[in-house]
């Protein structure tokens, strides 16, 4: 088989994970995962609640082959993409009259990666080169995180990427396809 069909080639290989330790384990609240709370409507006192289960974010999936130069993983890997609005929120009209989720006051929450997992992948190379083993770091779960005054707003504006989670001495990981590219593909479908 040739390699010409592999277009998912923007995956970063992370040879050693030691320099990017996983966040300390936290108790998982399953109620926050994949739930549409309150039927999409805000509770009576949307910003007074301290119950984190009221804030949910959507976990989508992203599957790709891992590549390193001409080499490609034997199997694709699947990770989570953290997306969506962390409710509860108020539905207010925008300037041109279409509905828009907007929280004009109260705490600001973002859906960001919570936990990561290391997965070992075998890379197959053309030309009879020996297979290589690598570890990749994949998003394993998402959570709604409250923005504090210590957060830079620009760091969290891109909800679906690891850029939302500042990490010392690390460049943001490129996605196989940018959110904008994905959106263009989605728009073509309608």
């Amino acid at each position: 088989q040739g390699w010409q069909a592999f277009k998912n080639d923007a995956t970063e290989i992370i040879p050693e994970l030691g320099e990017y330790p996983e966040p300390p384990p936290e108790l998982e609240n399953n109620k926050t995962m994949n739930r549409a709370e309150n039927g999409g409507r805000p509770p009576h006192h949307p910003f007074e609640t301290k119950d984190v289960s009221e804030y949910s974010c959507r976990e989508l999936h992203f599957t790709r082959y891992v590549t390193d130069g001409p080499c490609r993983s034997a199997k694709p890997v699947t990770e989570l993409v953290c997306s969506g609005q962390c409710g509860p929120a108020r539905l207010l009209p925008n300037a041109i009259g279409r509905g828009k989720w907007w929280r004009p006051s109260g705490p600001d929450f973002r859906c960001i990666p919570d936990r990561y997992r290391a997965q070992r992948v075998q890379l197959l190379c053309p030309g009879g080169e020996a297979p290589r083993a690598r570890k990749v770091r994949l998003v394993a779960s998402c959570k709604c995180k409250r923005l504090t005054r210590f957060h830079n707003q620009s760091e969290l504006k891109d909800f679906g990427t690891e850029a939302a989670r500042p990490q010392k001495g690390r460049k943001p990981r490129p996605r196989a396809r940018s959110a904008k590219a994905n959106q263009a593909e989605l728009e073509n479908a309608y």
Partner: nanobody
Framework: EVQLVESGGGLVQAGGSLRLSCATS????????MSWFRQAPGKQREFIAT???????DYIDSVKGRFTISRDNAKNTVYLQMNSLKPEDTAVYYC????????WGQGTQVTVSS
């Protein structure tokens, strides 16, 4: 929004055949590689096969020569033809696109009896 609807599963005797379909919408199907995965009870979801946008295919060793993945870009559908089925092929089968965000479909149950 990406939507994936798998169908064609069922109960079949060992050595029999099934053809699974995955109807997609919400993205430009012809531009994306498509994969089939499966998940047996109590096990992790595992990769089975990929068909790339250019038509090349890729399979795990355990299904090579028995399963064939194909696509119909006009119908936005990917197929998995499964022949010489074995009891260990019993699982829920899922399809997914590569390189775009999606939510897993409901899958289609395949049960192979001995």
């Amino acid at each position: 929004e990406v939507q994936l609807v798998e169908s064609g599963g069922g109960l079949v005797q060992a050595g029999g055949s099934l053809r699974l379909s995955c109807a997609t919408s919400g993205f430009t199907f012809s531009r994306f590689d498509m994969s089939w995965f499966r998940q047996a009870p109590g096990k992790q979801r595992e990769f089975i096969a990929t068909i790339f946008s250019g038509g090349d295919t890729d399979y795990i060793d355990s299904v090579k020569g028995r399963f064939t993945i194909s696509r119909d870009n006009a119908k936005n559908t990917v197929y998995l033809q499964m022949n010489s089925l074995k009891p260990e092929d019993t699982a829920v089968y899922y399809c997914c696109p590569l390189g775009i965000e999606y939510a897993w479909g409901q899958g289609t149950q395949v049960t192979v009896s001995s």
